[in-house]
């Protein structure tokens, strides 16, 4: 039959509210070397117990009886501390446990979840969460909006989740948790009403360096819109905007628009360049969310300047003309050059040279035409750029290099009657 238990004092009971500090104590009387006292909670050894053990000999001899007291301190009572507590000792080849003591939790409701501050778009549904527990249970919740209860009594309205169909003004929400011990009130959450995201961002007109865009504002509740902000960013390859990245990889070009009208002219853009644009509108409460990035593109323009460093030399019936690409922006893809030449009393001849930057002309009449001048213009798909100033044909001097180049011969008849290609040609003489 089992030996008699050495325990002479068993743990008591503790019941209290969260945060309470308490001590459980057990006492045993043993003969010989005192054992280590372990604490069990619900049958599980407490490995990190805040316990102290005191040993008092009852006699002079080590083999006399000892009184051993073990105290377990619970510093801030939590739900996880509740349960049945026992002391445990291993004595020789026997195991002994004390009678159990109980730790219980009872107090005002404790919030596991409280409503959080957040921003919502005007007239947009959202949910708020609140969760509380005892013991004692049950815990009934009562939601309040701007300090006004949303139900007739606790437990009658929405409980853990409050669905709000939409707000048109910034409001506060809180919840009360009721149990047999009383009432606890949660934090007050401020729900800030922002304008809805603008809709239908679109292009109104395009110029090589300018885009005009418009959009439809979203609802903003009782708060009028103060302004809208438009951002444009170059659509570099691999920038990731198409993949839905929330932020552009480089500093966007940002413009503010007074509203109404919900329209803005974006200037100082690069011609023939893809951009992504987005818009957000702001009220006194803050900004809406951005629209999705909209891909747009500026159209091509004509070159802004004439070709550079034009030189024209004449040697008998031949003329050699060469030039360099315009220094001024091309505003698009260079498609080629046009060249026009004219004598004093002869009609102007217009030629499309393509992308070459030099040409040899075969003149008629053994070069007897006097005061020949040449003009060159660059062109893109959008049209011709400005013509250069007329460059007189200088006589070729020995020692000057004469490039080997395919001759461009004029037709023998009629003289000086090159067909005018149907490109715009601005007279320059």
């Amino acid at each position: 039959q089992a030996e008699e238990s050495p325990f002479v004092g068993n743990p008591g009971n503790i019941t209290g509210a969260r945060g309470l500090t308490g001590t459980l104590r057990c006492q045993l009387q043993v003969q010989g070397e005192p054992p280590e006292v372990h604490w069990l909670r619900d049958g599980q050894i407490l490995e990190l117990a805040d316990s102290t053990q005191t040993q008092v000999p009852l006699g002079e001899d080590e083999q006399d009886d000892w009184i051993v007291v073990s105290q377990l301190r619970i510093t801030s009572l939590q739900l996880s501390d509740t349960g049945q507590y026992q002391c445990l000792v291993f004595l020789g080849h026997q195991t002994f446990v004390s009678q159990p003591g109980y730790v219980g939790l009872e107090g005002l409701p404790y919030f596991l979840e409280e409503p959080e501050d957040r921003t919502v778009a005007a007239n947009t549904p959202f949910n708020l969460s609140c969760q509380a527990q005892g013991p004692p249970e049950p815990v009934d919740l009562l939601w309040l909006q701007d300090a006004v209860p949303l139900a007739t009594a606790p437990g009658h309205g929405p409980q853990r989740s409050l669905h709000v169909p939409g707000l048109n003004k910034t409001s506060s929400f809180s919840c009360e948790a009721h149990n047999a011990k009383g009432v606890t009130t949660s934090r007050t959450a401020t729900i800030t009403v922002l304008p809805q995201q603008p809709r239908n961002l679109h292009l109104v007109s395009r110029q090589p360096t300018e885009l005009e865009v418009a959009w439809t504002p979203g609802l903003s509740g009782i708060y009028p819109l103060t302004h809208c902000t438009l951002q444009a960013v170059l659509s570099d390859d691999g920038m990731g905007i198409q993949a839905g990245e929330p932020d552009p990889p480089e500093e966007p070009l940002t413009s503010q628009a007074s509203v109404p009208p919900h329209q803005l002219r974006l200037g100082s853009l690069h011609p023939h360049t893809p951009y992504h644009i987005r818009v957000a509108c702001t009220s006194s409460q803050g900004p809406s969310s951005w629209t999705h990035w909209l891909p747009v593109e500026t159209p091509e323009g004509v070159p802004l300047g004439p070709p550079e460093n034009i030189s024209a030399t004449r040697n008998g019936s031949q003329a050699f003309v060469h030039w360099q690409e315009p220094r001024a922006p091309l505003q698009g893809t260079l498609l080629g050059y046009r060249l026009a030449y004219q004598g004093q009393d002869t009609p102007e001849v217009l030629m499309d040279i393509g992308l070459r930057q030099e040409v040899t002309l075969e003149l008629q009449g053994d070069g007897s035409v006097s005061n020949l001048t040449v003009c060159v213009a660059a062109y893109t798909a959008a049209g011709d750029g400005p013509w250069s100033l007329p460059v007189p044909l200088e006589a070729w001097r020995p020692g000057q290099a004469q490039p080997v180049h395919q001759l461009v011969k004029e037709p023998s008849t009629p003289a000086f009657s090159w067909p005018h290609h149907h490109h715009h040609h601005h007279h320059h003489h």
Epitope: D42, G43, Q44, I45, E47, Q84, L88, V97
Partner: antibody, heavy 116, light 106 residues
Framework: QVQLVQSGAEVKKPGASVKVSCKAS????????INWVRQAPGQGLEWMGW????????KYNEKFKGRVTMTRDTSISTAYMELSRLRSDDTAVYYC?????????WGQGTLVTVSS | QIVLTQSPDFQSVTPKEKVTITCSAS?????MYWYQQKPDQSPKSLIY???NLASGVPSRFSGSGSGTDYTLTINSLEAEDAATYYC?????????FGQGTKLEIK
């Protein structure tokens, strides 16, 4: 000396229930937890839950909640484990074991076979 | 739940040899417990609180370890030690066991 003696083998049909008993002797029955651990053929050990005979309090492994019920009769120092809605994969040896933070004494085991 | 992984799963050894079985926990624990189960018998407590020998266990058995790594050592194996050995933790609920190490005597 401490002894835990379990009831005999059982054969059950799927969907039925089984109740296994565990009679304790050699120690104060109401002071120590009685646990139930099972072992499927050729498999390892799986804890099912415990009962504290002094109060009747129980704690079950989540896996068995809703299917297992542990009870005791202190007058005859006996603990019981009932498993309901039996399936073929419940075929196992069921052990009761006294615990003192670990399982210091074990019953001899009860083979429960679930077969149609 | 804490997962315990024993190594090796199976070991064939000769008598008088020293045997080491390791048990690795998926997270840190305070104590480890070891059990011996012979064929067609119930498990028997071997080591408690990591290093204490249970009643009637020969002194050739010992346990050690801390944190996530624990060891059961049998110093001079005897024929009667042929069994499956299980580690077990109860640092967190539910208590769990290792998959077992089967020891065979050559």
């Amino acid at each position: 000396q401490v002894q835990l003696v379990q009831s005999g083998a059982e054969v059950k049909k799927p969907g039925a229930s089984v109740k296994v008993s565990c009679k304790a002797s050699g120690y104060p029955f109401t002071d120590f937890y009685i646990n139930w651990v099972r072992q499927a053929p050729g498999q390892g050990l799986e804890w099912m839950g415990w009962i504290y005979p002094g109060s009747g309090n129980t704690k079950y492994n989540e896996k068995f909640k809703g299917r297992v019920t542990m009870t005791r009769d202190t007058s005859i120092s006996t603990a019981y484990m009932e498993l309901s809605r039996l399936r073929s994969d419940d075929t196992a040896v069921y052990y009761c074991a006294r615990s003192t933070g670990f399982f210091d004494y074990w019953g001899q085991g009860t083979l429960v076979t679930v077969s149609s | 739940q804490i997962v315990l992984t024993q190594s090796p799963d199976f070991q064939s050894v000769t008598p008088k040899e020293k045997v080491t079985i390791t048990c690795s926990a998926s997270s840190s624990i305070g104590y480890m417990y070891w059990y011996q189960q012979k064929p067609d018998q119930s498990p028997k407590s071997l080591i408690y609180l990591t290093s204490n020998l249970a009643s009637g266990v020969p002194s050739r058995f010992s346990g050690s370890g801390s944190g996530t790594d624990y060891t059961l050592t049998i110093n001079s194996l005897e024929a009667e030690d042929a069994a499956t050995y299980y580690c077990q933790q109860w640092s967190s609920n539910p208590p769990t066991f290792g998959q077992g190490t089967k020891l065979e005597i050559k």
